[in-house]
C-alpha cells in the first residue's frame, strides 16, 4: 500500500518551506509557478493528482532531491519535460496517454536497469507503458488516453 498524507487545509503558499516527507496537493485546482521551486527538501512523495495540470514547470521540481514518487494521475498532461523524465530514480504515477512518450524515450535512453514503466487507465488499472504506447500511439494514431482494453500489468 502506498503511503498517504492529508492535504494542507489552507491555501498553498509556494514561499512556504514544507518540512514533511509527504505532501498532498491533490484536487486543489493548482497552477504551478513557472519560475519558482517548491521548497520541500525532505519530501519523498508529492501528490499533485487531479489538478488539471497540462505542463510541468521543470524549475518547480528542481530542488526536490529526495523525491521518490510523483503522483500526476488525473491531469491532462500534454508532455513530460525531459529533465524531469531523466530523473531515473523518480517513480511517476500518470494516466496512460501519448504525452508520456517523451518520458518513456528519455528513460529508455538514459536509465539502465529500470523496472518497467507503468501508467494507469481510467479504471485505475496499471499498464506497461511501453505496451500502451506501442498500441495506442503509433505514428498516425490520434492522441489517446487509457481505456480498459489494454493488457493488465501484474
Amino acid at each position: 500500500q502506498e503511503p498517504s498524507c492529508t492535504m494542507p487545509s489552507t491555501d498553498v503558499d509556494w514561499n512556504t518551506e514544507f518540512s514533511a516527507t509527504c505532501l498532498n496537493f491533490s484536487g486543489r485546482g493548482l497552477s504551478l509557478p513557472l519560475n519558482q521551486s517548491l521548497r520541500a527538501s525532505n519530501v519523498l512523495l508529492l501528490d499533485l493528482s487531479g489538478n488539471g495540470l497540462r505542463e510541468l514547470p521543470v524549475t518547480f521540481f528542481a530542488h526536490l532531491q529526495k523525491l521518490e514518487v510523483l503522483n500526476l494521475l488525473h491531469n491532462p498532461l500534454s508532455r513530460v519535460d525531459g529533465a524531469l523524465a531523466a530523473r531515473c530514480d523518480l517513480d511517476l504515477r500518470a494516466d496512460c496517454s501519448c504525452a508520456l512518450e517523451s518520458w518513456h524515450e528519455v528513460r529508455r535512453d538514459n536509465c539502465s536497469g529500470q523496472k518497467p514503466l507503468l501508467c494507469w487507465d481510467t479504471t485505475s488499472f496499471q499498464h506497461n507503458l511501453s505496451a500502451f504506447l506501442e498500441v495506442s500511439c503509433a505514428p498516425g494514431l490520434a492522441p489517446a488516453t487509457g481505456s480498459g482494453h489494454h493488457h493488465h500489468h501484474h
Epitope: E2, P3, C5
Partner: antibody
Framework: QITLKESGPGILQPSQTLSLTCSFS??????????VSWIRQPSGKGLEWLAH???????RYNPSLRSRLTISKDTSSNQVVLKLTNVDTADTATYYC?????????????????WGAGTTVTVSS | DVVMTQTPKSMSMSVGERVTLSCKAS??????VSWYQQKPDQSPKLLIF???NRYTGVPDRFTGSGSATDFTLTISSVQAEDLADYHC?????????FGSGTKLEIK
C-alpha cells in the same frame, strides 16, 4: 546479508565528546534513497531519534540536540560516525544505528528496516 | 515535534489471546507510522511500515491499521515468543519521534 554494528567508548566523563561509529555491510551509502540514522534508548525508556545522513551527504538533526551533534559518513570504509559534544549523565543510553533504504516496490515510504545490536554508553564522573 | 502516545504502558496476556496496542499522534502524520518489536536485550526489529504494511518475514498474526492520528497494532493470537516491548514511530516530519513503548508480558 545486511548488517550494522555500532562501536563506542563504553564509559566517558561529563563534558567529554562522545564518538560513535556505525560500520555496515551488505549495502552502499551511495545508492539513491539510502541513509543511516542514529537512535538512542536510555535503559527502560523509549527510543529517541538523533540524526540522519543521506546518500547525497545531506544531514538532518534533532533540534533538541542540534548544537551538540555532528553526523558524517565515509562511504569508502562503509562507516557513519556520530559525535555528541559536552556529554552529561542524561546521555547515558544504548545507541543504535539503523538503515533507511528505498524499496523500489514501496517507494515513498520511510522506515528503518535493519538495526545494529547497539552500543551501551555510560556517562559518569 | 509530533508526540506519539502509546497505550497501555504494559499488558499481560495469555497465549492465544488477541492483543491490541494503541498509538496516537499529536498531529496528522498520514500513514507514516512504523511498529517495531524489541525483545529483551535485543535491538528493535521492524514489524509494520506505512501503518499497515507487514514487513518481509513478519508472521501474519501481526496487523497494523490506522491513519492520520490513530494507529493500532493487533496480534491476532499471541504467542510466547511475542514477549517484547512494542514501539510506534512517525517518519512524517523531522524530528522523527517514537512512543514510549508498550511492554507485552505473557501469563
Amino acid at each position: 546479508q545486511i548488517t550494522l554494528k555500532e562501536s563506542g567508548p563504553g564509559i566517558l566523563q561529563p563534558s567529554q565528546t562522545l564518538s560513535l561509529t556505525c560500520s555496515f555491510s551488505g549495502f552502499s551509502l551511495t545508492t539513491s534513497g539510502m541513509g543511516v540514522s542514529w537512535i538512542r534508548q536510555p535503559s527502560g525508556k523509549g527510543l529517541e531519534w538523533l540524526a540522519h545522513i543521506y546518500w547525497d551527504d545531506d544531514k538532518r538533526y534533532n533540534p533538541s540536540l542540534r548544537s551538540r551533534l555532528t553526523i558524517s559518513k565515509d562511504t569508502s570504509s562503509n562507516q557513519v560516525v556520530l559525535k555528541l559534544t559536552n556529554v552529561d549523565t542524561a546521555d547515558t543510553a544504548t545507541y543504535y544505528c539503523a538503515r533507511r533504504a528505498r524499496d523500489y516496490y514501496n517507494s515513498g515510504h520511510w522506515y528503518f528496516d535493519v538495526w545494529g545490536a547497539g552500543t551501551t554508553v555510560t556517562v559518569s564522573s | 515535534d509530533v508526540v506519539m502516545t502509546q497505550t497501555p504502558k504494559s499488558m499481560s496476556m495469555s497465549v492465544g489471546e488477541r492483543v491490541t496496542l494503541s498509538c496516537k499522534a499529536s498531529e496528522n502524520v498520514g500513514t507514516y507510522v512504523s511498529w517495531y518489536q524489541q525483545k529483551p536485550d535485543q535491538s528493535p526489529k521492524l514489524l509494520i511500515f506505512g501503518a499497515s504494511n507487514r514487513y518481509t518475514g513478519v508472521p501474519d498474526r501481526f496487523t497494523g491499521s490506522g491513519s492520520a492520528t490513530d494507529f493500532t497494532l493487533t496480534i491476532s493470537s499471541v504467542q510466547a515468543e511475542d514477549l517484547a516491548d512494542y514501539h510506534c514511530g512517525q517518519t512524517y516530519s523531522f524530528p522523527f519521534t517514537f512512543g514510549s513503548g508498550t511492554k507485552l508480558e505473557i501469563k
